[in-house]
């Protein structure tokens, strides 16, 4: 019951997280005009990953897409890539995790397969969350660097009569959405990985006997066929205890089969 709850909660948390990553990626407010010196402005600028916008005091908002690909900063391209990779991995993870949910029965799918799928989706969520956090952090770092550069520019070359207003940008709402969403996806992924431990099938004594009888030949090991499909449960020669309890390093053996994730 606890396993099902952990798995279900992990799925829901990851779902919210991925929805947040998608929202953050689409949002226009990745960077917003710094209003420190002028809290009420007649023209307010903000920028996203895909377009920049200007909101006038009149209430009119004009947004323009970045129609160039080669002319954009490499960092912005990198952030876009990280966010898209995060979304794609998250979406695949969600798809896999739906089939892995213990409360959903699909044909004669065995628990070992569900365990492996749960682990796969968990790892995908973790990587997805890390991609989002990395993307947002790279953008935030870019903003901080530009902020101090433009601040330095504001106080130079003002010897003449005419002053030029340098627009400085600070953190937009999308950054916070991205950080939170990435964190949630990461947490959801960890929960799925934890749930995976309790989902592995409880081997019977009969199977254990059968296993010992087969000696050390991998070909005749229980779950050997399943292992070849990528959804096996016991790939090491370990003693299977009554009641299905497992040793610590047996649990650690799971990720070794998921290098393809």
């Amino acid at each position: 019951m606890a396993v099902t709850a952990c798995q279900g909660l992990g799925f829901v948390v990851s779902l919210i997280g991925i929805a947040g990553i998608i929202a953050a990626t689409c949002m226009d407010q990745w960077s917003t005009q710094d209003l420190y010196n002028n809290p009420v402005t007649a023209v307010f600028n903000y920028q996203g990953l895909w377009r920049s916008c200007v909101r006038e005091s009149s209430g009119f908002t004009e947004c323009r897409g970045y129609f160039t690909l080669l002319g954009l900063p490499a960092m912005l391209q990198a952030v876009r890539a990280l966010m898209i990779v995060g979304i794609v991995l998250g979406a695949i993870g969600l798809l896999v995790s739906i089939f892995a949910l213990k409360c959903i029965r699909i044909g004669s799918m065995e628990d070992s397969a569900k365990a492996n799928m749960t682990l796969t989706s968990g790892i995908m969520f973790i990587v997805s969350g890390l991609c989002a956090i990395a993307g947002v952090s790279v953008f935030a770092n870019m903003l901080v660097t530009n902020f101090w550069m433009s601040t330095a520019n504001m106080y130079t070359g003002m010897g003449g009569m005419v002053q030029t207003v340098q627009t400085r940008y600070t953190f937009g709402a999308a950054l916070f959405v991205g950080w939170v969403a990435g964190g949630l996806t990461l947490i959801g992924g960890v929960m799925m990985c934890i749930a995976c431990r309790g989902l592995a099938p409880e081997e019977t004594n009969y199977k254990a006997v059968s296993y010992h009888a087969s000696g050390h030949s991998v070909a005749y090991k229980p779950g050997g066929f399943k292992a070849s499909t990528g959804f096996g449960s016991n790939t090491k020669n370990k003693k299977i205890y009554d009641g299905g309890a497992r040793t610590e390093d047996e649990v650690q053996s799971y990720p070794s089969k998921h290098d393809y994730v």
Partner: antibody, heavy 118, light 113 residues
């Protein structure tokens, strides 16, 4: 067509308050900010502030801060501008003006003359 | 506050001739976000409220004759009446629409020579 109709002329004593109204018609009232601009006799234009009829948010010229209050009545599509602690230098024609693209004022009221005299 | 300075104070031009007036701001009115200059030109005739001619420094409001042209960027702007008509006699104001408080120039009075 868009129309901004202002209240009639006012004569006030120094220290008193005046409340000028501006009734809008011919467009979606809450879709455009309303500004107030005054013009002293023979002088130039001076922006006083504006109000967002949708949210009710205001921006005032610091020069009038504390003396000017802008309010709205959505039910009648009317904007009000109240100026308190009147002085003789507040004698002017007060205009309401609708804010348009580029923060420009595309439609203006006919003006309300406020005379401050003892 | 952004200070708007208009020149000349008055301008006498013959009918059909070109009239040019200038407006200078103490700070740039160019917004980096959309590369638009937040400067507006108004025409005011005696006893009337101002009338919007040009916004974003060079965009003519619909219904405004094409003899009115706005130009300039940053801090220096110009309003040109290519062929002055009798009905163009008025005071012309420029306005900073970029930063609060919104400020107006002192005006340029256009008369017929």
């Amino acid at each position: 067509q868009v129309q901004l109709v202002q209240s009639g002329a006012e004569v006030k004593k120094p220290g008193a308050s005046v409340k000028v109204s501006c009734k809008a018609s011919g467009y979606t009232f809450t879709g455009y900010n309303m500004n107030w601009v005054r013009q002293a006799p023979g002088q130039g234009l001076e922006w006083m502030g504006n109000i967002d009829p949708y949210y009710g948010g205001t921006s005032y010229n610091q020069k009038f801060k504390g003396r000017v209050t802008m309010t709205i009545d959505k039910s009648t599509s009317t904007v009000y501008m109240e100026l308190s602690s009147l002085r003789s230098e507040d004698t002017a024609v007060y205009y309401c003006a609708r804010m348009y693209h580029g923060n420009a004022f595309d439609y203006w009221g006919q003006g309300t003359t406020v005379t401050v005299s003892s | 506050d952004i200070v708007m300075t208009q020149s000349p104070d008055s301008l006498a031009v013959s009918l059909g001739e070109r009239a040019t007036m200038n407006c200078k701001s103490s700070q740039s009115l160019l917004n980096s976000g959309n590369l638009k200059n937040y400067l507006t030109w108004y025409q005011q005739k005696p006893g009337q409220p101002p009338k919007l001619l040009i916004y974003w420094a060079s965009t003519r409001k619909s219904g405004v004759p094409d003899r009115f042209t706005g130009s300039g960027s940053g801090t220096d702007f110009t309003l040109t009446i290519s062929s002055l008509q009798a009905e163009d006699v008025a005071v012309y104001y420029c306005q900073n629409d970029y930063s609060y408080p919104l400020t107006f120039g002192g005006g340029t009075k256009v008369e017929i020579k």
